[in-house]
Interface confidence: low
C-alpha cells in the first residue's frame, strides 16, 4: 500500500539521484588528481545525511557541513569566476579556459549541478514525486540551502581578482536577490580579494550601449566599494566572438572590439 506523501509544488528528486551523484564523484576524482584522495562513498553518505529523514523545509547550512568538509577544495588566486543568470556561457568559458573555475567546476558544484533532491521527515526514502519550491513552499529546502552553503564557501575562499559574468539582457543586470547578489557578494573577503571584475554580457548583435553604466551595476559597484574591494567592469559586446577569441586568440580581429574596459 503506497504511503501518504506530502505534495510539494516543485518537481521531485531527479531520477537515479544517488547513482548520478556517485558516478559524478568518481568521474570528477578521476579527472582531478588533487581530489583523488576523496572517498566517493563517504561523499554520498555525507550528502545523503544532509537531507534524508529531515523535514525538507527545515534544512540548515549546518546539515551540509560534513559534505562541505569532505569536498574542501581551493581555487588559485585570480581564477574564480562567479556568474549570475548566465550559467551556460560561464561554463562554456571555463571549458575552454581550463584554469578558471566556476562553482560547478568544483567537486560539490559538479555533483549537484542541475539536480533536484529532497527527503521527508522520519523516513529513509527519497521523494521522487515532489520537492519544495523556493517561492511557493519554503526557502530552507535541501537544494536551495545546498547552493547557499557552497556558494558562501566558494566566495569566502576566493582571492586576488574575482571575475563575475552578468547577463546584460536582463532588466536587473545585477540582482540583489540572486545567489551572487545575496550570498557571494557579501562573502568575498576584502583582506584576500583585491578586486571584482564584472563582465557584462550583451545579448543583441547591434547593442553598443555601455551597460557598465547601468544603475544596477552602479549599485553593485557601491556595495563592493563599501567593502573595500576595487571594482572594474567590462562590456562583452559579442559573446560569440568573446568565446571564439578565447579559443583562437591569434585571430587579428580579437585584438579589438570584443570588450571595453571601465576602471572605477
Amino acid at each position: 500500500v503506497p504511503r501518504w506523501r506530502q505534495q510539494w509544488s516543485g518537481s521531485g528528486t531527479t531520477s537515479r539521484f544517488p547513482e548520478t551523484v556517485l558516478a559524478r564523484c568518481v568521474k570528477y576524482t578521476e579527472v582531478h588528481p588533487e581530489m583523488r584522495h576523496v572517498d566517493c562513498q563517504s561523499v554520498w553518505d555525507a550528502f545523503k545525511g544532509a537531507f534524508i529523514s529531515k523535514y525538507p523545509c527545515n534544512i540548515t547550512e549546518e546539515d551540509y557541513q560534513p559534505l562541505v568538509k569532505l569536498g574542501t577544495q581551493t581555487v588559485p588566486c585570480n581564477k574564480t569566476l562567479l556568474w549570475s543568470r548566465i550559467k551556460d556561457l560561464a561554463h562554456q568559458f571555463t571549458q575552454v579556459q581550463r584554469d578558471m573555475f566556476t562553482l560547478e567546476d568544483m567537486l560539490l558544484g559538479y555533483l549537484a549541478d542541475d539536480l533536484t533532491w529532497c527527503g521527508e521527515f522520519n523516513t529513509f526514502e527519497i521523494n521522487y514525486q515532489s520537492c519544495p519550491d523556493w517561492r511557493k513552499d519554503c526557502s530552507n529546502n535541501p537544494v536551495s540551502v545546498f547552493w547557499k552553503t557552497v556558494s558562501r564557501r566558494f566566495a569566502e575562499t576566493a582571492c586576488g581578482v574575482v571575475h563575475v559574468m552578468l547577463n546584460g539582457s536582463r532588466s536587473k543586470i545585477f540582482d540583489k536577490n540572486s545567489t551572487f547578489g545575496s550570498v557571494e557578494v557579501h562573502n568575498l573577503q576584502p583582506e584576500k580579494v583585491q578586486a571584482l571584475e564584472a563582465w557584462v554580457i550583451h545579448g543583441g548583435r547591434e547593442d553598443s550601449r555601455d551597460l557598465c553604466q547601468d544603475p544596477t551595476i552602479k549599485e553593485l559597484e557601491s556595495i563592493i566599494s563599501k567593502r573595500n574591494i576595487r571594482f572594474f567592469c567590462k562590456n562583452i559586446y559579442r559573446p560569440d566572438k568573446f568565446l571564439q577569441c578565447v579559443k583562437n586568440p591569434e585571430d587579428s580581429s580579437c585584438l579589438s572590439g570584443i570588450h571595453h574596459h571601465h576602471h572605477h
Epitope: E30, V31, P33, N78, K79, L81, Q95, V96, Q97, R98, D99, M100, H163, C245, V246, K247, N248, P249, E250, C254
Partner: antibody, heavy 123, light 107 residues
C-alpha cells in the same frame, strides 16, 4: 597523472610527409591545449602550433603555416602532427606537450611533455 | 614575433654555488613567462610559470623573478642534478617563443 606517449622515430625522404602521434593516458585530454614543439640537433626549442581537442581548434606558427596539420581524436585521446614537404632542415626531435593557460586569451605554458620523436630527413 | 634573449650562453658554476640566469624579451610579456630545464636526451621539464610560480614538485632552490621584459631564474645552491640547459618561454604574444637556452655546466 597524465602522461603523453609519442610514436617512434622516423626516417623520411625529402619532399615526403611525416605524421607523429601523441597519446594521453591517465587523465583528461580533451579540454587542454596540446602543443607541438621541435628541437633541431644541438639547437633550441621552436613552437609549431597547438590544438584544443574539445574545440577542434588548431593554430599554427606562421613559419609552418601550410606545411603542418595538427589534429586530435578524442575517442583515443591522441593528438597528431603531420608535417609535409619535408626538407633536411626539418630533421629534429618533435615534442608534444600539454598547455595550461590563463584566462581570456588562452596564453599557456607547457606542463607535461611527451618523450619526443626523432624525425630524420635524408635522401 | 617577440625575441627572447638569454644570457649567458654558458654558465660555469661549482656545486653548492648560486646560479643566476637572465632572460630578456624584445617587448613586454607581462608575467607570462615560463622556465624549463632540459637534460641531454630528455624532454624539457617545467620549472616556473607566471614568471615566479614554481611548478608542482620543483624544489624551493629554484626561483623566478621579473616582469615586463627582464626576467631572472635563480638556483640558490646548485646540486649535481641541476646541470642542464635552461630555456625561457614567453606566452604573452603569438607565436609563443623560446630563448636560445643557457647551459649550466660544472666548473
Amino acid at each position: 597523472q597524465v602522461q603523453l606517449v609519442q610514436s617512434g622515430a622516423e626516417v623520411k625522404k625529402p619532399g615526403s610527409s611525416v605524421k607523429v602521434s601523441c597519446k594521453a593516458s591517465g587523465g583528461s585530454f580533451s579540454n587542454y591545449a596540446i602543443g607541438w614543439v621541435r628541437q633541431a640537433p644541438g639547437q633550441g626549442l621552436e613552437w609549431m602550433g597547438r590544438i584544443i581537442p574539445v574545440l577542434d581548434a588548431a593554430h599554427y606558427a606562421q613559419k609552418f603555416q601550410g606545411r603542418v596539420t595538427i589534429t586530435a581524436d578524442e575517442s583515443t585521446s591522441t593528438a597528431y602532427m603531420e608535417l609535409s614537404s619535408l626538407r633536411s632542415e626539418d630533421t629534429a626531435v618533435y615534442y608534444c606537450a600539454r598547455g595550461l593557460g590563463y584566462y581570456l586569451y588562452s596564453s599557456y605554458y607547457f606542463d607535461i611533455w611527451g618523450q619526443g620523436t626523432l624525425v630524420t630527413v635524408s635522401s | 614575433e617577440i625575441v627572447m634573449t638569454q644570457s649567458p650562453a654558458t654558465l660555469s658554476v661549482s656545486p653548492g654555488e648560486r646560479a643566476t640566469l637572465s632572460c630578456r624579451a624584445s617587448q613586454s610579456v607581462s608575467s607570462n613567462l615560463a622556465w624549463y630545464q632540459q637534460k641531454p636526451g630528455q624532454a624539457p621539464r617545467l620549472l616556473i610559470y607566471g614568471a615566479s610560480t614554481r611548478a608542482t614538485g620543483i624544489p624551493a632552490r629554484f626561483s623566478g623573478s621579473g616582469s615586463g621584459t627582464e626576467f631572472t631564474l635563480t638556483i640558490s645552491s646548485l646540486q649535481s642534478e641541476d646541470f642542464a640547459v635552461y630555456y625561457c618561454q614567453q606566452y604573452n604574444n603569438w607565436p609563443w617563443t623560446f630563448g636560445q637556452g643557457t647551459k649550466v655546466e660544472i666548473k
